[in-house]
C-alpha cells in the first residue's frame, strides 16, 4: 500500500508569493510559494495519486503583516481552503497567548491540530479540551493512518503559552500515545511535529512504532540530487534513521516559508512496515501557476493589510534617529528603541531564580534604514517602521559563549569610520571602545546585564559563560561579516518578524521617548 505525504513547515505567514529568499515578492516572474501556488500543486498531486495526506508541522503563525493584522484567522481560512489533513502545533502558534491560538485557529480549523507533549492544567484544561489532540487516526483510501503530534519543549522560552500549559519531553510523551494507536490496530504511524531536526531524528530512533517523522522548527532543507534553488541540503531526502529496534525510519522536513512542498512516497507492507520511501521537496517556482480562486481570495483579504499600514500604532515625543551617520558610528536612540523592543518581546518569567531568561540584544546599525520624525504629530505607523526595517527579517534567540560575543564586538569596530553596517547597537550591554588600539583589540570594557538576579545590574562579560542574546536573523546567519556568530552559535531559535516586534512594543508603550544613554562609549 502506497501513501503520498505532502508536507509544509515553518510557513510563517507567507500567504502571498515571495522572492527567492522568502522576502517580499519584487519581480513576479521570479517569485515562489504562496498558498495559491501551493494549492495548484497539491490539487495536481491529489488528482494523480490515490492516497494523499497534506500535513503541516507547525509555525504557520508569525512572519509578515498578514499575521499582525489577521492574528491567525488567515491561517485557519487558507489552510481550510487547501484542505490540510492535520497540523502540529509549533512554538509560534502561542505568540498571541493561548487565547490567540484558541479563538482564531483551534476553533476555526476544519482539520485536527496535534500535540502529544502539551498538557493543559487548571482552568484552561476544560476550556481547551478537544480543541487540540495528542493524535488523530485518519482514513486514507481503504486504510487508516495514525498521526501523532509534538511541539518543542522550549516553547515557554520562545513564545507565550502562559502558565497553564506544561510542555513535556517529546519522547516521553509520544511513546504512550503511539502505544495507544498500536492497541487500536493502527499500524501506520506518522510523528508530525515541531522540535527541530535533531529531535526529529531522536524520535525516529527512540519512539517504538513510529514509521515516519515529519518535522519542522529548524528550517531543515533535505534533498536527493541537485538542489533546485540556493538552499544547501543538510542531508538526503528522506533522511533515514535506524531505530533502536532496527527499523529504517524516514525523517523529512521541507525548509520553510512555503517555498517548497515536501513530497514523500512511502510503501507499506500489509503489517504496516515501511518497505520503501522516496521523494524530494518540490520547489514552488513560477512554472507552477497560482490557482485563480485562491489568488482572488488572497487579493480580497489583502485590502485590510493596506489600510492597516497607515494607522497609528503609538506616538514618539522625541526624534527617532535612524540616520546612517548616527547608527553606523555611535549609539543611536533608534537602535536603543529596537533593542528594548526585542528584549521586551522576549520577557518570559519562567524561573524564580531569573528575572528573565535573556537580557541582551545586539543589532547591526546597517539594518536601521530610516529615522522617524516626531514633528509629524508624533505618529508612528507600520509604514514608518517598514522604512526603518525594510528587509523583512526576524529577531531570533541564540546562545553564544562570551568569547564569541567579544569577537563580535571587536568586529563591530574593526574598520570603524567607513559608514559600514556592522557597527552594533545594543541593549543590556555596556561597551567601551578604544579606537586608538589596533583592530581586533579595541574593546576595552564589555559589561552585560545579569539575568540570574533579582536586581538587574551590569557585570563583566565572562569568556567561558554561555549567554542568551536576541539578534536579527541576518546576524545569526553571519551577515555583515559576523561569521563568528554563525560558526560558534550553540543554539538558534527563530523569532518574530522584526517590524511586528517593534510595532507591538510601541502599541504597548503608547508614547515612547528613547534616549542615548551611554550604552556605547569611546575612551
Amino acid at each position: 500500500w502506497e501513501l503520498t505525504i505532502l508536507h509544509t513547515n515553518d510557513v510563517h505567514s507567507r500567504l502571498e508569493q515571495t522572492s527567492e529568499d522568502s522576502s517580499k515578492c519584487v519581480n513576479a516572474s521570479r517569485c515562489m510559494g504562496g498558498v495559491a501556488r501551493l494549492f495548484t500543486k497539491v490539487q495536481q498531486i491529489r488528482r494523480a495519486e490515490p492516497n494523499v495526506l497534506l500535513l503541516d508541522a507547525g509555525d504557520q503563525y508569525q512572519g509578515t503583516i498578514w499575521f499582525t493584522v489577521y492574528k491567525g484567522a488567515e491561517v485557519a481560512h487558507f489552510m481550510n481552503a487547501l484542505r490540510y489533513d492535520a497540523m502540529a502545533l509549533g512554538n509560534h502558534e502561542f505568540d498571541n497567548g493561548v487565547e490567540g491560538l484558541i479563538e482564531p485557529l483551534l476553533k476555526e480549523a476544519k482539520f485536527p491540530i496535534l500535540s502529544a507533549n502539551i498538557k493543559a492544567k487548571g482552568p484552561l484544561a476544560s476550556q481547551i479540551s478537544g480543541l487540540y489532540l495528542p493524535y488523530k487516526v485518519l482514513p486514507v483510501g481503504d486504510e487508516v493512518v495514525g498521526i501523532v503530534g509534538y511541539t518543542s519543549k522550549e516553547t515557554p522560552f520562545l513564545s507565550n503559552p502562559g502558565t497553564n500549559l506544561v510542555f513535556e519531553d517529546e519522547i516521553t510523551a509520544l511513546q504512550p500515545e503511539v502505544d495507544k494507536l498500536k492497541t487500536l490496530n493502527v499500524n501506520k504511524i506518522i510523528a508530525l511535529g515541531h522540535s527541530g531536526f535533531e529531535m526529529d531524528k531522536l524520535i525516529a530512533q527512540k519512539v517504538r512504532g513510529v514509521d515516519v517523522v515529519v518535522g519542522g522548527h529548524s528550517n531543515t532543507f533535505l534533498y536527493t540530487g541537485n538542489p533546485p534553488s540556493k538552499e544547501v541540503p543538510a542531508g538526503k531526502y528522506p533522511f533515514i534513521v535506524t531505530s533502536d529496534d532496527g527499523r529504517k525510519v524516514p525523517v523529512v522536513q521541507a525548509y520553510a516559508f512555503g517555498k517548497y512542498l515536501g513530497y514523500l512516497k512511502i510503501e507499506f507492507d500489509e503489517r504496516g512496515n515501511v518497505i520503501s520511501s522516496h521523494g524530494n521537496p518540490i520547489l514552488l517556482n513560477s512554472s507552477i501557476p497560482e490557482d485563480p480562486s485562491i489568488k482572488a481570495d488572497i487579493n480580497k483579504w489583502r485590502i485590510k493589510l493596506d489600510n492597516y499600514s497607515t494607522q497609528e500604532l503609538g506616538k514618539t515625543i522625541v526624534y527617532l534617529d535612524g540616520s546612517s551617520q548616527s547608527c553606523r558610528f555611535r549609539e543611536c536612540n533608534m537602535g536603543n528603541l529596537i533593542c528594548d523592543a526585542m528584549i521586551n518581546n522576549n520577557l518570559r518569567h519562567t524561573d524564580e531564580m531569573f528575572w528573565n531568561h535573556v537580557s541582551m540584544c545586539i543589532l547591526n546599525g546597517g539594518g536601521i534604514r530610516s529615522p522617524i520624525d516626531e514633528r509629524n504629530n508624533g505618529t508612528i505607523t507600520w509604514e514608518n517602521l517598514a522604512a526603518v526595517l525594510p528587509f523583512g527579517g526576524t529577531f531570533d534567540l541564540v546562545q553564544l559563549k562570551g568569547s564569541t560575543l567579544k569577537k563580535a564586538f571587536e568586529h563591530s569596530v574593526h574598520r570603524y569610520g567607513q559608514s559600514t553596517g556592522e557597527f552594533l547597537q545594543v541593549g543590556g550591554i555596556h561597551v567601551v571602545y578604544d579606537l586608538s588600539r589596533k583592530p581586533g583589540d579595541r574593546v576595552v570594557k564589555l559589561d552585560v546585564l545579569c539575568t540570574k538576579c533579582r536586581v538587574p545590574s551590569y557585570d563583566p562579560l565572562k569568556m567561558d559563560e554561555v549567554y542568551k542574546v536576541i539578534l536579527p536573523n541576518f546576524l545569526a546567519n553571519g551577515g555583515d561579516g559576523f561569521q563568528m556568530i554563525k560558526d560558534e552559535l550553540l543554539r538558534h531559535d527563530s523569532g518574530d518578524q522584526d517590524i511586528n516586534v517593534v510595532s507591538t512594543y510601541i502599541s504597548k508603550m503608547k508614547v515612547i521617548y528613547p534616549a542615548v544613554e551611554g550604552r556605547i562609549k569611546f575612551s
Partner: antibody, heavy 117, light 106 residues
Framework: EVQLVESGGGLVQPGGSLRLSCAAS????????MHWVRQAPGKGLEWVAV????????YYADSVKGRFTISRDNSKNALYLQMNSLRAEDTAVYYC??????????WGQGTLVTVSS | AIQMTQSPSSLSASVGDRVTITCRAS??????LAWYQQKPGKAPKLLIY???TLQSGVPSRFSGSGSGTDFTLTISSLQPEDFATYYC????????FGQGTRLEIK
C-alpha cells in the same frame, strides 16, 4: 519589478560638466545605499562613489575626488552624479547600482559619457 | 587602497568543464568579497557575495570560497551561457574591482 534607469550621458569637451541621473522604481529607494560604477570602453569596472540611504555619508574613488559629487532625492526616487572638470579618462559607461556586493544588488543598464574635443 | 589581482586574465574552456578563477587582495579583507559576471553590452550581474553566499536566482554550479586574502570562484560544469567576463570586488574598504577574467569557448 526593480528598475534603475540612467540618463544624462553624452558628448562633452574636456573641462566641461555633465549631470547624470538615475531613476529608481520597484523598491523602497530611501532604504538603500546607492553607488555609481563606471566602465571605460573595453576596460574593467571602476567604482566611482557611494551615498548612504539618507544622504548623510558619501565616499568617492580617489580618481574623481573633488570633481564629482553624488547626491540623491529620496522624494523623487532619484540618484545623481554631478561631474565637473571632465577629462578624457572619464569616458565610460556609467552605471548606478544599489548596495553592491550584497543581497539587494541591482544595476541599471548604464549611460555613456564621452569626453572628447 | 586595497588592490585586487585576478588570475588568469583570460581562459579557454569547453562546455561541461570545471573552471576556477582566483582573486588575491593586497591585504586581508575577511569575507568582504563578491563575484560578478558581465556579458558584452550588459550590466554586471552579482553571482556571489560575502565570499561564498550565492545570490538569489544564480545557478548552484557557481560557488565561492576563501577568506582573508585568497578567494576562488568555481563553476562546477560550464554551460554555454557562462562564457563571459568575471570580476571579483572587495567591499572591505571603498569598493575595488579586480581587472577581470575573460572566459571564452575553447
Amino acid at each position: 519589478e526593480v528598475q534603475l534607469v540612467e540618463s544624462g550621458g553624452g558628448l562633452v569637451q574636456p573641462g566641461g560638466s555633465l549631470r547624470l541621473s538615475c531613476a529608481a522604481s520597484g523598491f523602497t529607494f530611501s532604504s538603500y545605499d546607492m553607488h555609481w560604477v563606471r566602465q571605460a570602453p573595453g576596460k574593467g569596472l571602476e567604482w566611482v562613489a557611494v551615498m548612504s540611504y539618507d544622504g548623510s555619508n558619501k565616499y568617492y574613488a580617489d580618481s574623481v575626488k573633488g570633481r564629482f559629487t553624488i547626491s540623491r532625492d529620496n522624494s523623487k526616487n532619484a540618484l545623481y552624479l554631478q561631474m565637473n572638470s571632465l577629462r578624457a579618462e572619464d569616458t565610460a559607461v556609467y552605471y548606478c547600482a544599489t548596495e553592491i556586493a550584497a543581497k539587494g544588488d541591482y544595476w541599471g543598464q548604464g549611460t555613456l559619457v564621452t569626453v572628447s574635443s | 587602497a586595497i588592490q585586487m589581482t585576478q588570475s588568469p586574465s583570460s581562459l579557454s574552456a569547453s562546455v561541461g568543464d570545471r573552471v576556477t578563477i582566483t582573486c588575491r587582495a593586497s591585504q586581508g579583507i575577511s569575507n568582504y568579497l563578491a563575484w560578478y559576471q558581465q556579458k558584452p553590452g550588459k550590466a554586471p550581474k552579482l553571482l556571489i557575495y560575502a565570499a561564498s553566499t550565492l545570490q538569489s536566482g544564480v545557478p548552484s554550479r557557481f560557488s565561492g570560497s576563501g577568506s582573508g586574502t585568497d578567494f576562488t570562484l568555481t563553476i562546477s560544469s560550464l554551460q554555454p551561457e557562462d562564457f563571459a567576463t568575471y570580476y571579483c570586488q572587495q567591499s572591505y574598504s571603498t569598493p575595488h574591482f579586480g581587472q577581470g577574467t575573460r572566459l571564452e569557448i575553447k
